[in-house]
Amino acid sequence: PPRGRILGGREAEAHARPYMASVQLNGAHLCGGVLVAEQWVLSAAHCLEDAADGKVQVLLGAHSLSQPEPSKRLYDVLRAVPHPDSQPDTIDHDLLLLQLSEKATLGPAVRPLPWQRVDRDVAPGTLCDVAGWGIVNHAGRRPDSLQHVLLPVLDRATCNRRTHHDGAITERLMCAESNRRDSCKGDSGGPLVCGGVLEGVVTSGSRVCGNRKKPGIYTRVASYAAWIDSVLA
């Protein structure tokens, strides 16, 4: 099943997020992703855990998953590079870089997103944008078109409370509010964009969604700048 959902959001403006990618397994949406360079998409490592025997591809330039759109193109994956420290049983280091079979054809609907290199926490309360094709309600309805939601960043101390994530949020992770509006599971790999810059990637650990006491967890890309640069080099 697809890993992910945007809860409490709405349909995104078509093609206004040219960095948005759909990571697909055997032709079906699996996870979100974000174009960070002409030939590289950043996603979450856990997305490929169950994909050993399947064909992984990346869809760029899409708003609708099913309808024909001039900007849409499906790319094969030349190489999948999970973070070397990612493990199935932990949310830590949940990053994956996918090298496309060729450089993406750039245009208004396909363009890399600048990512944060300054390793500094986003101020609590900052409103950040999350987008994805995951299910949109607890009944499991899957949208055909890209959805998005604005979420406030939550301070790490609150996120680490015993009633919340109980100390699991390291300095390499960040949280956002999850009170009725939320990302979850496999919007996993999708971008958390603050002030027009990629700050976080939705983690793919399983957790209840839309519950204010279980905030959304995002991998801070600035904390992994050296690794990202080394892979893209």
């Epitope: 409490g8 709405r10 349909e11 995104a12 403006e13 206004a16 997020r17 600048p114 300054v118 986003v122 101020a123 609590p124 309360g125 900052t126 409103l127 944008d129 987008a131 998005h148 604005l150 406030p152 960043v153 509010e177 009170n179 009725r180 509006r181 964009v193 603050c194 002030g195 027009g196 810059v197 204010r212």
Partner: antibody, heavy 121, light 106 residues
């Protein structure tokens, strides 16, 4: 058409409190954040804070801690801001504002009509 | 917090002139918004995400910049452009505005 209609001018005494309102129309009130901005007489704009009317989640500029409280009433599609312990420094025009698009950026694309608060004995 | 400094505070120009006003941020931001305000009215969105004109804004306006330095340019000033222009950053809470540039037409 999205519209934000604010309550009328207020003349209040120092030390008192005032609650101003912002009634929204033309869109789903619970779908978007409502922000408040202060414009003092030097025409300086100060962001006060926001509220998510759907769940009550709010954030505030620390500068206004203890001064401003933002709330929202879903049933009437109205946002409120209460200002307390008023002094002459609080005399200003207060705006509600929001972003009603669906792009990756957000800005204040709709502003309220403004409420003038005058603090004077 | 990110402090935005606008210059000049007052700009005087004749119709048809090209004018540029600047907004400098105390820390790097990725995009900047601009608003226009005329006396007695609420601010109006004017330029969003650095260079995109809001609905109804004449094409003689343009925005540019990156990092800590942004600008709003009017290629040929007209009388109706007389107003105060404010920049605003949305990269980090608290969201801040510049002190404004008042454009006067000679």
């Amino acid at each position: 058409e999205v519209q934000l209609q604010q309550s009328g001018p207020e003349l209040v005494k120092p030390g008192a409190s005032v609650k101003i309102s912002c009634k929204a129309s033309g869109y789903s009130f619970t779908g978007y954040y409502m922000h408040w901005v202060k414009q003092s007489h030097g025409n300086i704009l100060d962001w006060i804070g926001y509220i998510d009317p759907d769940n009550g989640v709010s954030s505030k500029n620390q500068k206004f801690t203890g001064k401003a409280t933002v709330t929202a009433d879903k049933s009437s599609s109205t946002a409120y801001m209460e200002l307390r312990s008023l002094t002459s420094e609080d005399s200003a025009v207060y705006y509600c504002a929001g972003y009603y698009g669906s792009s990756w950026y957000w800005y204040f694309d709709v502003w309220g009509t403004g409420t003038t608060v005058t603090v004077s004995s | 917090q990110i402090v935005l400094s606008q210059s000049p505070a007052i700009l005087s120009a004749s119709p048809g002139e090209k004018v540029t006003m600047t907004c400098r941020a105390s820390s790097s931001v990725s995009y900047m918004h601009w608003y226009q305000q005329k006396p007695g009215s609420s601010p109006k969105p004017w330029i969003y995400a650095t260079s995109n004109l809001a609905s109804g804004v004449p094409a003689r306006f343009s925005g540019s910049g990156s990092g800590t330095s942004y600008s709003l340019t009017i290629s040929r000033v007209e009388a109706e452009d007389a107003a105060t222009y404010y920049c605003q950053q949305w990269s980090s809470n608290p969201y801040t505005f510049g002190g404004g540039t008042k454009l006067e037409i000679k």
